[in-house]
Amino acid sequence: SEVEYRAEVGQNAYLPCFYTPAAPGNLVPVCWGKGACPVFECGNVVLRTDERDVNYWTSRYWLNGDFRKGDVSLTIENVTLADSGIYCCRIQIPGIMNDEKFNLKLVIKPAKVTPAPTRQRDFTAAFPRMLTTRGHGPAETQTLGSLPDINLTQISTLANELRDSRLANDLRDSGATIRIG
């Protein structure tokens, strides 16, 4: 079953997908499509990479991570309700039926009316989890410290863009990443 992600109308949505290249720069083609992953390829392709670069894209769809190191997470800019649905991240590993397929469900919520600014308690209390950050060295574990005064709209942005606390890395535990080679 697909993993579910949420964003509000007007925000950027973030759909995580990772793989580990067998060697630096030894890239595997990846496609992103709207709709569940079919038997082959991606349906309704919105973005595609080859062994070197993004070679097809449609407006509002971007890879903002380092896809040359396997971060093929999709950013959808300025989402509308029409962006809701299943998205397929397909890592096209050479060989017959070797592809890895991830179905991610995007739920778009109507934008909230911004409430008056309120003091937010310690962010670790709201999101009490450890996260693994990716760098060039060994993985390290860190906790989130407290953030300055932020309103509920900002908290919503932090949570559903995921990158703001790098919670996307937790998705490795739920199978949204693959090692190649």
Epitope: N12, Y14, G25, R52, D53, V54, N55, W57, W62, L63, N64, G65, D66, F67, R68, K69, D71, T75, T133, R134, G135, H136, T157, E161, R163, D164, S165, R166, N169
Partner: antibody, heavy 118, light 106 residues
């Protein structure tokens, strides 16, 4: 509105180190990469390096031994540190946001001029 | 490193003329990107991924090319186009810029 603003020391003595801060607004540093580019007076653009949303970095190999790029997401700041400055490091230093897809820099700061002189 | 060579270094044109500047890469690249810079200002994104105009760029500008040869064309030059234009690639590290083409309006 997306903005980037550099702040630096202006004047640096030879062999000393340089620290420049890029303060951004209108977007989250966790969702975009930020690059550093410099331009010597009357010359072209030179890429120094960048920091990704997840904190990993890429550097120009010619300068890698002297460069360090880091950031503080909560303060929306990116930092450039360069060691062992010489007179040919005199330049205008820019930070710029990466648009995504390994493509181009869609928003640039106004730059900060750094002069290396005794 | 992929070296980008821009030509000509200086281009002089009269208003209304069509002009083309080129950028040659020492190795094949997937895309070329272009920036416009006027004296005293920061570079502005102008054309990305070879042929896509950045926001606010007039339609008289166009970009084309593939492999090692790319170009920026202005169909009818206007006085406000006077600037230096830089090409840039990031098909392989490090990211590199060309030395620039300075467009002067007669």
């Amino acid at each position: 509105q997306v903005k980037l603003q550099e702040s630096g020391p202006g004047l640096v003595a030879p062999s000393q180190s340089l620290s420049i801060t890029c303060t951004v607004s209108g977007f989250s540093l966790t969702g975009y990469g930020v690059h550093w580019v410099r331009q010597p007076p009357g010359k072209g653009l030179e890429w120094l390096g960048m920091i990704w949303g997840d904190g990993s970095t890429d550097y120009n190999s010619a300068l890698k031994s002297r460069l360090s790029i880091s950031k503080d997401n909560s303060k929306s700041q990116v930092f450039l540190k360069m060691n062992s400055l010489q007179t040919d490091d005199t330049a205008r230093y820019y930070c710029a946001r990466d648009r995504g897809n390994h493509w181009y820099f869609d928003v640039w700061g106004q730059g900060t001029t750094v002069t290396v002189s005794s | 490193d992929i070296e980008l060579t821009q030509s000509p270094a200086i281009l002089s044109a009269s208003p209304g003329e069509k002009v083309t500047m080129t950028c040659r890469a020492s190795s094949s690249v997937s895309y070329m990107h272009w920036y416009q810079q006027k004296p005293g200002s920061s570079p502005k994104p102008w054309i990305y991924a070879t042929s896509n105009l950045a926001s606010g760029v007039p339609a008289r500008f166009s970009g084309s090319g593939s492999g090692t040869s790319y170009s920026l064309t202005i169909s009818r030059v206007e006085a406000e186009d006077a600037a230096t234009y830089y090409c840039q690639q990031w098909s392989s590290n490090p990211l590199t810029f060309g030395a620039g083409t300075k467009l002067e309006i007669k």
